[in-house]
């Protein structure tokens, strides 16, 4: 058993039918010695008396808010949450496995640049009685500071019969140098509580591996005289690290017909312009990627050929 | 501690091409190692990230773009001094700081070259003959060093009398390749910046 925050305790349980459970001793936070009784949640049934209460915690019915009283007056509370260990693995019931880039990916994180700012998000099908708290650091043995905001509900989606809720959080490394070569990963820890169930999720990454630039901006077409060709030009996104000659991007230019089945023409360039043939009813899209470290491509920025 | 904006004319920077080749070569070698050593801890998540140049060179700090010198987090660096003549410096106006930066890159390459050659000698003794270092990568390191053309005493290749532990050698290869790829990215960024300045 360990303290999550004041008066909230997590009991770690080997979780299988008929498991023996854990013996927990609760102590009433009071100088009083006599006449103390204990109750659980809203029930008035007295579970025991005395300054301490010993309970065998085996299932969710044994968790909840334990209260010690004296003469009708509440002396203190202890909220017990359960952390299930199924076959030796901590349960992951609250969050949905996003399965990208691999199984057991519950947290996904992205950064728009090398400033040390990043966003993480996760999914759940649970809509009520749910709280999250997020901590982060650079490295774990001698952790350096990363400050995270509060997790917020950022999207709701309908998936088949289920509603899916997306939560996200923004974090900023306290003293980040964009040019630094990372040797210690960023660690992100999310505590999730649903009713009386506690779970924790972690993700470990280097900023360089989660880079996903914003799409190129100011995408423009300039027709070339007496030709079906057009000059496409664009600019680095505002959110990308500077100077651009140091933090260079590479670009992919795509000409896509109206039908998804039509052949796509693709050109790769380090410049911020390209000459392509604009077909009728086609659209031109451009996306960006770090020129030297192949992390994710940005989303496409698009303009119609017409 | 930074690169000045007044540097050689655009396109006149002979090291840019070599540094691009270097990044391509080390990335290919790392990919090959990860595929060949699939049952070894060779992914970025599995390895310890060690930097053999730590406390010996200070490439990131010495090659910091001018724009980032205002960022205090980029300036908590170590003092290191280097030899300061080199043929990538295509203009006499090149400052001492830029020479420091390029000589730091040269020292990095020299250190990695020695490590890779020592490691290759061990891998050639492996009866499994599972993986060797790509000769193209070693050649590209050499070409960039020649383009930088710093006079520096040669570091003798390390030789070991004891029987090599091939498992450990292959894991060390993965660690080295990951670290060298990261350094190659920095070198490419620096060369691109100098070329544009």
């Amino acid at each position: 058993i360990w303290e999550l925050k004041k008066d909230v305790y997590v009991v770690e349980l080997d979780w299988y039918p008929d498991a023996p459970g854990e013996m927990v001793v609760l102590t009433c936070d009071t100088p009083e010695e006599d006449g103390i009784t204990w109750t659980l949640d809203q029930s008035s049934e007295v579970l025991g008396s005395g300054k301490t209460l010993t309970i065998q915690v085996k299932e969710f019915g044994d968790a909840g808010q334990y209260t010690c009283h004296k003469g009708g007056e509440v002396l203190s509370h202890s909220l017990l949450l359960l952390h299930k260990k199924e076959d030796g693995i901590w349960s992951t019931d609250i969050l949905k496995d996003q399965k990208e880039p691999k199984n057991k990916t519950f947290l996904r994180c992205e950064a728009k640049n090398y400033s040390g700012r990043f966003t993480c998000w996760w999914l759940t099908t649970i809509s009520t009685d749910l709280t999250f708290s997020v901590k982060s650091s650079r490295g774990s043995s001698d952790p350096q500071g990363v400050t995270c905001g509060a997790a917020t509900l950022s999207a709701e989606r309908v998936r088949g019969d289920n509603k899916e809720y997306e939560y996200s959080v923004e974090c900023q490394e306290d003293s980040a140098c964009p040019a630094a070569e990372e040797s210690l990963p960023i660690e992100v820890m999310v505590d999730a509580v649903h009713k009386l169930k506690y779970e924790n999720y972690t993700s470990s990454f280097f900023i360089r591996d989660i880079i996903k630039p914003d799409p190129p901006k100011n995408l423009q077409l300039k027709p070339l005289k007496n030709s079906r060709q057009v000059e496409v030009s664009w600019e680095y996104p505002d959110t990308w690290s500077t100077p651009h000659s140091y933090f260079s991007l590479t670009f992919c230019v795509q000409v896509q017909g109206k039908s998804k089945r039509e052949k796509k023409d693709r050109v790769f360039t380090d410049k911020t312009s390209a000459t392509v043939i604009c077909r009728k009813n086609a659209s031109i899209s451009v996306r960006a990627q770090d020129r030297y470290y192949s992390s994710s491509w940005s989303e496409w920025a698009s303009v119609p050929c017409s | 501690r930074n690169l000045p904006v007044a540097t050689p004319d655009p396109g006149m920077f002979p090291c840019l091409h070599h540094s691009q080749n270097l990044l391509r070569a080390v990335s290919n070698m790392l990919q090959k190692a990860r595929q060949t050593l699939e049952f070894y801890p060779c992914t970025s998540e599995e390895i310890d990230h060690e930097d053999i140049t730590k406390d010996k060179t200070s490439t990131v700090e010495a090659c910091l773009p001018l724009e980032l010198t205002k960022n205090e987090s980029c300036l908590n660096s170590r003092e290191t001094s280097f030899i300061t003549n080199g043929s990538c410096l295509a203009s006499r106006k090149t400052s001492f700081m830029m020479a420091l930066c390029l000589s730091s890159i040269y020292e990095d390459l020299k250190m990695y070259q020695v490590e890779f050659k020592t490691m290759n000698a061990k891998l050639l003794m492996d009866p499994k003959r599972q993986i060797f270092l790509d000769q193209n990568m070693l050649a590209v390191i050499d070409e960039l060093m020649q383009a930088l053309n710093f006079n520096s005493e040669t570091v003798p290749q390390k030789s070991s009398l004891e029987e090599p532990d091939f498992y450990k050698t292959k894991i060390k290869l993965c660690i080295l390749l990951h670290a060298f790829r990261i350094r190659a990215v920095t070198i490419d960024r620096v060369m691109s910046y100098l070329n544009a300045s």
């Epitope: 299988y16 199924e86 076959d87 349960s91 019931d93 057991k104 099908t125 | -």
Partner: antibody, heavy 112, light 107 residues
Amino acid sequence: EVQLVESGGGLVQPGGSLRLSCAASGFTFSDYGMVWVRQAPGKGLEWVASISSGSSNIYYADTVKGRFTISRDNAKNTLYLQMNSLRAEDTAVYYCARNPYWGQGTLVTVSS
Amino acid sequence: DIQMTQSPSSLSASVGDRVTITCKASQNVGTNVAWYQQKPGKAPKGLIYSASHRYSGVPDRFSGSGSGTDFTLTISSLQPEDFATYYCQQYNSYPLTFGGGTKVEIK
């Protein structure tokens, strides 16, 4: 007493469908992840699919992905395995399990 | 996928013998290994989880050990009811995979 009882097995033609059920009792079913495991005649054990307590996380073996669907109804204390496009190699005894307890199994025979 | 290689595939032993079955994972699985017992015509039954933890009610003559890639199930003193087939399983990553089984027969 913990009990897991499978049903729904039988003889089916290749390409056909079956729905297996597993009735759970003796424990709080809704608090536990569940799995289906199968055993071809005279062979070893093969994991088929897993589902978390609240159905948010589901995993399948590659051999059944896209053909089988694991689901559960916590109100009915029942685990299901919907099997479509059945093949001869799906012939096996199918067990539902929540360690350390396994059901007695139900035999699925796919044959023309 | 992670392969679990169990050995031996069968063994003959007498009541009172100490029996050791080994299981080798093709890559590191930490301690996420379970052991099962299956008697002819019956369903398997869980014995060990997390490589070395016995489920409640499992006799203490059964013990498990190991981590990483090498795991062992030991029966310290074989009893008549222990003649069965034993399987190891890794659940470190999906797909979950079982060993081929070890049949423990009466000598």
